[in-house]
Interface confidence: low
């Protein structure tokens, strides 16, 4: 090496294992700063998540018995919740240049840890919003009870599915070592197949996103046409904030499985793929933000007062295992989403 | 059309020095990464020495084989690489390529030139 | 240094066959970053320079007859040639530039 200290930051183009595709148009630089913005990034969304997310499932756990409705926002909360305490420990390797310190069994399991709460959590959204269309424009014979059990199997059905979704990273990952800087890495390694490649993207964008993102928006604006006259701004914000969050990431999939290598279309990609990576993370601890913001009324009563609002706007004030369902317009009224 | 142009190549003894210039055009040569690589009958083809653009430092890198003795060096002002070789050995001899790197790959070459070190 | 080791060293077909040649290397040479193969083949004509056919083990550069394929993944990489004309007359390299920057020996074809 003619530079015989040189530095090694995550990202930094000093090593050449990293030949400039990111300076396609001669914009490299020694110390990029995209490679080290998600440290602050998963700070932050750690610091926010994990007490957020520890609040609402505490509060949703305590109800779930008497509210139906409420094991959504705990398995959701729970999902949540693994995501953000798993980031610390992904962390290390950005803050280490990319050396993957946890092994080859590591390497298998802790990216796939935090992609099934990701999953789990944006399926879970779906599922959520799809049970609260049918609770309100369902046929009547729909009892608590009935809901109960379906909350139940939906639930488990989005974590199997979520598990699934995981799967194929698990059986594709592996370590791999770099000599130049010396480095042990995590990668993903398709075996040069491009047609595994594409039907891993293909299928994580329509069940990680497109198909998630239907149910939620077709449901929320269901639900606005059919059952609501005033604005529902819950729910317009965790569409809204599911797309805004989940969008770049898949986009992202979508783009480095078909731009062509060298194009400046997947330099750019791959510079900004640490920030999208971590404006989905982020949607993990967006949901207790909406609750608190939007119950932040009564957040001057206290804070499990704003989940507890929340609870009541995300699926029926009223509705519990020994109540009967009311009437579909009067349980909607008292929706959110 | 991206051209390259190396010159300043020849007969030189053991020891002695040699620098040879390469002559670049149709790119903006000051974005470039260039590199030399040579190439002889023994060794075949071989990376010898590599210099980044401005936003890189200028950084160089050498092949373990020529570390200490070649220099690589840029004019951007002139849209100009050179590698001054000090030291030279038998092992020396071959074909300098100028070639524009980065992007993981060698995409043009010059013509080369031909260093012989003999005595 | 990763060593790059070719196979056949030589070898003599007639035109309009299919021609294969095998590019291994001392180590795996996918970036974790980009997920693309650091190899790349390239085919020297007597007298001339070098010149790129293929990078990232599979992308063909512009203007290369797409009877030259790239394959594989790793450390084992092929480079096909599927109806060799007489042009293809040429010595054929691959060149790793994942960890420095290492070529093989060299596959010479020949049109019988």
């Known amino acids: 090496m003619g530079n015989d200290s040189v530095s090694y930051e995550y990202g930094d183009y000093s090593d050449l294992s990293d030949r400039p595709v990111d300076c396609l148009d001669g914009a490299c630089l020694a110390i990029d700063p995209l490679r080290v913005a998600p440290l602050p990034l998963y700070a932050a969304i750690f610091l926010v998540g994990v007490p957020g997310n520890a609040m609402v499932a505490w509060v949703a756990g305590k109800v779930a018995r008497r509210r139906v409705g409420a094991t959504w926002l705990l398995h959701l909360a729970v999902a949540d919740l693994l995501c953000c305490l798993s980031l610390p420990i992904l962390a290390v390797p950005i803050a280490r240049g990319g050396h993957w310190p946890y092994g080859a069994v590591g390497c298998r399991a802790l990216p796939s840890i935090i992609l099934l709460t990701m999953y789990a959590s944006v399926l879970l959204l779906a599922a959520l919003s799809a049970d609260l269309c049918f609770l309100a424009l369902g046929p009547a014979w729909w009892s608590t009870v009935q809901r109960a059990c379906g909350v139940q199997v939906a639930c488990g059905a989005a974590w199997t599915l979520a598990l699934l979704l995981t799967v194929p990273s698990a059986i594709y990952r592996r370590l791999h070592q770099e000599h130049f800087p010396a480095r042990l890495q995590c990668v993903v390694d398709y075996g040069g197949s491009s047609s595994t490649e594409n039907a891993v993207t293909a299928i994580r964008f329509l069940f990680g996103f497109l198909g998630p993102l239907v149910a939620v928006a077709s449901c929320h604006s269901a639900l606005l046409c059919w059952a609501a006259r005033r604005c529902r701004p819950l729910g317009t914000a965790i569409v809204v904030g599911f797309f805004v969050c989940w969008a770049p990431y898949h986009l992202l999939g979508l783009v480095l499985t078909v731009a062509a290598p060298n194009s400046a279309l997947l330099a750019r990609a791959l510079r900004a793929e640490p920030l999208i990576v971590g404006l989905a993370l982020a949607h993990s601890c967006l949901n207790p933000m909406l609750f608190l913001y939007f119950g932040r009324a009564q957040l001057r009563r206290s804070l499990p007062a704003a989940c507890h609002w929340a609870l009541r706007e995300s699926q029926g004030q009223d509705e519990s295992v020994d109540s009967k369902k009311s009437t579909s317009h009067d349980l909607v009224s008292e929706m959110e989403v | 059309e991206v051209k390259l142009e190396e010159s300043g190549g020849g007969l030189v003894q053991p020891g002695g020095s040699m620098k040879l210039s390469c002559a670049a055009s149709?790119?903006?040569?000051?974005?470039?990464?260039m590199d030399w690589v040579r190439q002889s009958p023994e060794k075949g083809l071989e990376w010898v020495a590599e210099?980044?653009?401005?936003?890189?430092?200028?950084?160089?890198y050498y092949a373990e084989s020529v570390k200490g003795r070649f220099t690589i060096s840029r004019d951007d002002s002139k849209s100009s690489v050179y590698l001054q070789m000090n030291s030279l050995r038998a092992e020396d001899t071959g074909i300098y390529y100028c070639?524009?790197?980065?992007?993981?790959?060698?995409?043009?070459w010059g013509q080369g030139t031909t260093v012989t070190v003999s005595s | 240094d990763i060593v790059m080791s070719q196979s056949p060293s030589s070898l003599a077909v007639s035109a309009g066959e299919k021609v294969t040649m095998s590019c291994k290397s001392s180590?795996?040479?996918?970036?974790?970053?980009?997920?693309?193969?650091?190899l790349a083949w390239y085919q020297q004509k007597p007298g001339q320079s070098p010149k790129l056919l293929i990078y990232?083990?599979?992308t063909r550069e512009s203007g290369v007859p797409d009877r030259f394929t790239g394959s594989g993944s790793g450390t084992d990489f092929t480079l096909t040639i599927s109806s060799v004309q007489a042009e293809d007359l040429a010595l054929y390299f691959c060149?790793?530039?994942?960890?420095?920057?290492?070529f093989g020996a060299g596959t010479k074809l020949e049109i019988k």
């Open positions: 210099i980044r653009n401005k936003a890189n430092n200028h950084a160089t």
């Open positions: 180590q795996s040479l996918l970036s974790s970053r980009t997920r693309k193969n650091y």
């Open positions: 070639t524009r790197g980065g992007y993981y790959v060698f995409a043009y």
């Open positions: 990232w083990a599979s």
């Open positions: 149709g790119f903006t040569f000051s974005d470039a990464w």
């Open positions: 060149n790793q530039s994942y960890d420095l920057l290492t």
